[in-house]
């Protein structure tokens, strides 16, 4: 038996031979799993516990937000001395257990990622039969989903004393900076107006006076990529039409 | 001591697969996760992903998701890395390297015994 | 991911003298949850398969001799050898383990001047 010594002031990968001791309940989980939207992520999680070779039911807990009262996204039970761990949830279907709890592995696969997926995920196991324990990790992993910009909403809306204004609406991750560009805007582009503002992964940019006629394009960029998108303005019409 | 030894150098064709081996001794094979690194001539070190010998749970990079397969032997204490669909920028030295006591509490996964090194030549 | 960008790219140093290398992560390593950096230091010597020096930005691994040092945090860490000795020529990379896929500086080359 391999036993790590975990007093601080001696090298933590120091190890000694030992006999084996009781061990204590732990879940170890990175601090953080990067991933990009549309993508799979597997996001580790592995346990120790008290109680010698545990065969009896165990049932496997994923939850997303906040530890203990998190809503669950993934949920599977496994029989006394069985290895399988029936799957009772999964959300979206997206979620699948990729370790084995018996081995003290209950690490999770995420299928199709999308923004909304960045949060932070916490294991549990729970223990019935002979012995009823059970234990979640505190801190929990992040996942931190990755994307490209993507231009959700790009519109013309009338502003005061009969002008328009420009408002541009993007998601990302990083979360893109916002560019407007278009007639007597300068050189084919706008440094990020003052009134934009992120949410999230969503950030949005306002062009607060459309002073000419024509196009104005919205340019969302990060370190993934680059998007854009134009709206047309025609007062000589009396409206305003938009093209993406 | 801590000791892992890879299976010999290889020369393939493109599309094919190679398999290296890495035994490993002087430790509990399954008290530690065992990592796969490359390196390409002249290169940096790149992650591939690794395998949990307890639990068989694998971990792969995305770029290499579905070309790659790491197995383990618990019997032989030895650990595989599978790589298919060769190219020939998948020329380079495949290291194993014993990472994270899974006992321990913090996330401590860095790389602390290096296997020596297995060369693969991908060459039509 | 996050990326790791190592400077210089090369340096050359007098026997004696104090190497430095920096490395700079694209997002933080820190972990606010145990106040821990997730960043290590290797070495790679000609023909020769890496050696973990140092871990936690600071820790050395055992064995490692003491001329050797992590300093950093955050975004920002820093590999100083007190006194270059002719035996620590090699490339010299970070890794941190904060984020997975966990992923290294390109490495620094490490002369004598």
């Known amino acids: 038996f391999v036993r790590t010594k975990i007093d601080t002031t001696e090298n933590l990968l120091n190890t000694e031979v030992h006999s084996s001791p009781a061990q204590r309940w732990s879940m170890q989980v990175p601090a953080e799993v990067s991933a990009a939207a549309g993508d799979a992520a597997v996001l580790p999680c592995t346990f120790t516990h008290p109680h010698r070779h545990y065969d009896g039911p165990l049932t496997a807990i994923w939850r997303a937000g906040e530890p203990y009262a998190g809503p669950q996204v993934f949920r599977c039970a496994a029989a006394r001395g069985s290895e399988l761990c029936q799957t009772a949830l999964s959300l979206h279907g997206r979620f699948r257990l990729l370790g084995n709890p018996r081995r003290n592995d209950l690490s999770l696969r995420v299928e199709r990622l999308a923004l909304a997926d960045d949060r932070r995920y916490f294991c549990r196991v729970e223990f019935a039969g002979d012995v009823h324990d059970r234990y979640e990790s505190r801190h929990g992993v992040r996942l931190h989903v990755t994307a490209a910009p993507r231009i959700i909403n790009i519109s013309v809306l009338p502003g005061p004393a009969h002008a328009f204004r420009a408002l541009c609406t993007a998601e990302g991750e990083p979360p893109p900076a916002l560019a407007w560009s278009g007639p007597a805007l300068g050189n084919g582009s706008a440094a990020v107006p003052s009134s934009g503002q992120g949410h999230g992964h969503l950030v949005t940019a306002e062009l607060p006076a459309l002073n000419h006629d024509g196009r104005y394009t919205c340019t969302a960029a990060n370190s993934l990529g680059r998007s854009e998108a134009s709206v047309y303005l025609f007062r000589f019409h009396g409206a305003s039409g938009a093209s993406t | 001591q801590v000791q892992l030894v890879q299976s010999g150098a290889e020369v393939k064709k493109p599309g094919a697969s190679v398999k290296v081996s890495c035994k490993a001794s002087?430790?509990?094979?399954?008290?530690?996760?065992m990592h796969w690194v490359r390196q390409a001539p002249g290169q940096g070190l790149e992650w591939m992903g690794w395998?949990?010998?307890?639990?068989?749970?694998?971990n792969y990079a995305q770029r290499f998701q579905g070309r790659v397969t790491m197995t383990r032997d618990t019997s032989i204490s030895t650990a595989y890395m599978e790589l298919s669909r060769l190219r020939s920028d998948d020329t380079a030295v495949y290291y194993c390297?014993?990472?994270?006591?899974?006992?321990?509490?913090?996330?401590?996964?860095?790389?602390?015994?290096w296997g020596q090194g297995t060369s693969v030549t991908v060459s039509s | 991911d996050i990326v790791m960008t190592q400077s210089p790219d090369s340096l050359a140093v007098s026997l004696g003298e104090r190497a430095t290398i920096n490395c700079k992560s694209s997002?933080?390593?820190?972990?606010?949850?145990?106040?821990?950096?997730?960043l290590a230091w290797y070495q790679q010597k000609p023909g020769q398969p890496p050696k973990l020096l140092i871990y936690?930005?600071?820790t050395r691994e055992s064995g490692v001799p003491d001329r050797f040092s992590g300093s950093g945090s955050g975004t920002d860490f820093t590999l100083t050898i007190s006194s270059l000795q002719a035996e620590d020529v090699a490339v010299y990379y970070c890794?941190?383990?904060?984020?997975?896929?966990?992923?290294f500086g390109q490495g620094t080359k490490l002369e004598i001047k």
């Open positions: 997002r933080s390593v820190l972990y606010s949850s145990n106040n821990k950096n997730y």
């Open positions: 390297a014993r990472g994270r006591l899974l006992r321990f509490f913090d996330w401590l996964d860095v790389m602390d015994a």
């Open positions: 395998i949990n010998p307890n639990s068989d749970g694998t």
């Open positions: 890794q941190q383990y904060y984020s997975i896929p966990y992923t």
């Open positions: 002087g430790y509990t094979f399954t008290d530690y996760y």
């Open positions: 936690w930005a600071s």
